[in-house]
Interface confidence: low
């Protein structure tokens, strides 16, 4: 199906590890699959912007911890 | 302001801790905020269903670990 | 701030217009801004996957219409 | 199955049609489903707040149009 085509691949082509955890309101972890060979971490910032986080940087653990602290 | 009318609430009414990590394709961590006093963990299953996970550790850590393993 | 750096730019580098509206559960429209010169349309599929839609294709209007029909 | 416990509900309790399009940075259209009988329109404002928009008001079309204008 066309949804599976090479066009779709990964949503995250560029990633960053430069983000302040307190600016993040939610984080989505998307499993690797036929559409994308690597897992993806997409953060939503307070202003509604979305960014992809670097999986190699240990930052995401800190972010998840911070998000879960109520 | 009238914008105040458009209130959100928690998405998660009930939570479960019995979910098989391998059934999950993505996981969203939503920070607590004015709309909801507790952080929320929403998993999307392979069949497209969304469920709320119990924040009690460490199941979600296991799930995140599994999702990130490519 | 580093979050504003060129690395972040647009989340959607690749887009598709080949997607079945019925496979989509939600659609996010992100306004253009300093981080990204064009608006972005991100669709979430039933299986939790996310894809970027082509803004030039009139398909997204059909998708929005379909999503709003309850 | 115990997974059934993790129910979601509608995010939007109240909606508003009183919102200035220029205050909105992103808009999410969520399809109705088992978790919620009606489609939902959630706007993220510049200040990071999220509000639910009234689906009956034609305003959202104007907002989407404005968001997509780069």
């Amino acid at each position: 199906e066309a949804e599976e085509d090479g066009d779709l691949q990964c949503l995250c082509v560029k990633t960053t590890s430069q983000v302040r955890p307190r600016h993040i309101t939610s984080l989505e972890v998307i499993k690797a699959g036929p559409h994308c060979p690597t897992a993806q971490l997409i953060a939503t910032l307070k202003n509604g912007r979305k960014i992809c986080l670097d999986l190699q940087a240990p930052l995401y653990k800190k972010i998840i911890k911070k998000l879960l602290e109520s | 302001e009238a914008e105040e009318d458009g209130d959100l609430q928690c998405l998660c009414v009930k939570t479960t801790s019995q979910v098989r990590p391998r059934h999950i394709t993505s996981l969203e961590v939503i920070k607590a905020g004015p709309h909801c006093p507790t952080a929320q963990l929403i998993a999307t299953l392979k069949n497209g269903r969304k469920i709320c996970l119990d924040l009690q550790a460490p199941l979600y850590k296991k799930i995140i670990k599994k999702l990130l393993e490519s | 701030e580093a979050e504003e750096d060129g690395d972040l730019q647009c989340l959607c580098v690749k887009t598709t217009s080949q997607v079945r509206p019925r496979h989509i559960t939600s659609l996010e429209v992100i306004k253009a801004g300093p981080h990204c010169p064009t608006a972005q349309l991100i669709a979430t599929l039933k299986n939790g996957r996310k894809i970027c839609l082509d803004l030039q294709a009139p398909l997204y209007k059909k998708i929005i219409k379909k999503l709003l029909e309850s | 199955e115990a997974e059934e416990d993790g129910d979601l509900q509608c995010l939007c309790v109240k909606t508003t049609s009183q919102v200035r399009p220029r205050h909105i940075t992103s808009l999410e259209v969520i399809k109705a489903g088992p978790h919620c009988p009606t489609a939902q329109l959630i706007a993220t404002l510049k200040n990071g707040r999220k509000i639910c928009l009234d689906l009956q008001a034609p305003l959202y079309k104007k907002i989407i149009k404005k968001l997509l204008e780069s």
């Epitope: - | 998660c12 098989r20 550790a57 | - | 199955e1 115990a2």
Partner: antibody
Framework: SLEESGGRLVTPGGPLTLTCTVS????????VSWVRQAPGEGLEWIGT?????NTYYASWAKGRFTISKTSTTVDLRITSPTTEDTATYFC?????????????WGPGTLVTVSS | QVLTQTPSSVSAAVGGTVTINCQAS????????LAWYQQKPGQPPKLLIY???DLASGVPSRFKGSGSGTQFILTISGVQCDDAASYYC?????????????FGGGTEVVVE
Amino acid sequence: SLEESGGRLVTPGGPLTLTCTVSGFSLSSYGVSWVRQAPGEGLEWIGTITVSRNTYYASWAKGRFTISKTSTTVDLRITSPTTEDTATYFCARSLSSYYYAFNIWGPGTLVTVSS
Amino acid sequence: QVLTQTPSSVSAAVGGTVTINCQASQSLYDEKNLAWYQQKPGQPPKLLIYDASDLASGVPSRFKGSGSGTQFILTISGVQCDDAASYYCQGEFDCSSGDCSVFGGGTEVVVE
């Protein structure tokens, strides 16, 4: 910590409620289970109440026991005690979100059912 | 769902090794959701191992858990007098097909 109370000598048939009082953690973050141990016997899982008040019971315990909670206590109601319900009753907190691996236990409270 | 523990009783010399088996009648939830406890007379149980092989906080490394699916083992090496107690395995099963949680029948360890 956890502490059970309410254990006593009862006659068969009269309902009995045991209370588990928690301190040092929140019931909005952890589930609590009830486990019992008859004299000289092994451990038996009775049931669990989760963060979101979902309850799960052992098949043998359904209808015989009811678990409920407030913000700081978890109650176990024995609907109609029989002599087989004579045991020490423990409440326990899960290490995680599972229905097993209980890392914090109360000291137990003894229930004796006798006519 | 049943967890069968063997043997029901075992004797060991100080410094020796004890092996306790726990067999599940069907595969555990997520394959490894099994815990081991130690219980001494008049006391509540103490968690030793969870997730089949993870050591609980403060538990000496001479306690070792292994196994997956339906077969699990608790090994106590370099047995000490303080290890004399009853040991129980506890498994988590799929709640939708019966009991969420089940304990094994127990194994009494006597240290000579």
